[in-house]
Amino acid sequence: EEELQIIQPDKSVSVAAGESAILHCTITSLFPVGPIQWFRGAGPARVLIYNQRQGPFPRVTTVSETTKRENMDFSISISNITPADAGTYYCIKFRKGSPDTEFKSGAGTELSVRAKPS
C-alpha cells in the first residue's frame, strides 16, 4: 500500500475580485478510505469550505467527479471571489470512522485577491 500524499501544487494563486479561483489538490492513494475536506485557515479557527459528504456549498464546485470511487482529483473552484475569501486553503484527507478523523493535509495554497479590473 503506497503511503498517501496530498499534493497542492500551487503555493499561491492570485485572482481578481468577482472571478473564480481554482484550487488544485490531488491524492496519490485511495487508502485510507474517507472523505476529503477543504478548509480556509489552520487550527481551531479554520473555516470549512467544502466537504465531499455534506453540502450544499453554493459557491464551490469540484473540478472532477469526486463521487467516482477511483477519483484522485479533489480540486475545487470557488466562484465570485471577494477580498473576504483571501487566506490559505488546505485540502485535508479524513479517515472514515465514527467520527471521521483527520489523517493528512496538503501544504496549503494561499489565495490572494486583486482589486476588480476597472
Partner: antibody, heavy 119, light 108 residues
Amino acid sequence: DVQLVESGGGVVRPGESLRLSCAASGFTFSSYDMNWVRQAPGEGLEWVSLISGSGEIIYYADSVKGRFTISRDNSKNTLYLQMNSLRAEDTAVYYCAKENNRYRFFDYWGLGTLVTVSS
Amino acid sequence: ETVLTQSPGTLSLSPGERATLNCRASQSVYTYLAWYQEKPGQAPRLLIYDASSRATGIPDRFSGSGSGTEFTLTISSLESEDFAVYYCQQYYDRPPLTFGGGTKVEIK
C-alpha cells in the same frame, strides 16, 4: 552554485529610510519566490516578507506592514526591500532567502546585511 | 499564528556525544517543518525539511523526526563544526512563516 548577496545596510536615524538589495545568481531567479528574514542582535530569526516569482503575490509580517515594501526586478536578478519609517526595533541583520520550489522553506540564504537604527 | 517553542535553550555537550533538540508547535503543522543551522558570519543552512528529509549535502549524522506538534532534530555524534545555533521553522500555517527561538549547541 546558488549565490545571494545582500547590500544596502547601514546606520540610520529613527524615521529614516533605507533600501536593501539582494543580487541572485546560479538559478532561474524569476521561477522562485523570494523572502527577507531578519535577526535582531542576540535574538532569533524573524520572517519579514515574501514575493512570488512574478511579483504578483506579496506578504508582510505585521511588524513591518505599511512601512516596508518588497519588490523584485527579474531582468536584473535582484530582490529589494524598501524600508521606511525605520524604528530602533528594526535593527537587525537582514537576510535574503530563496524558497524551495514546492514549499515555503528556504534552501539558500545570503550572508546578510546589517541595518542599525539609532539616534 | 503558529508559535514554535524550542528546547532546551542551550545544550552543553562534548564532541562525539549525541544531541537531541526539540521543537514544539502550538498547533499541528503535520510534517511541514524545517531545521536550519546558523554559525556566526555564515549564511544559515538548511538541514532538514518535511520534518525528516535531509537537504542536499547534509551529513547523515543529522536526522529529523516527528509530526503534528512535536519534532526532534538529532545529531548522532557531534563534530567540532556542529557547535552552532539551530532553528526550526514551520511552513504550514501561513502567513506568517514562523521560527522557533533557537537552541544553542555549545562545547562543554
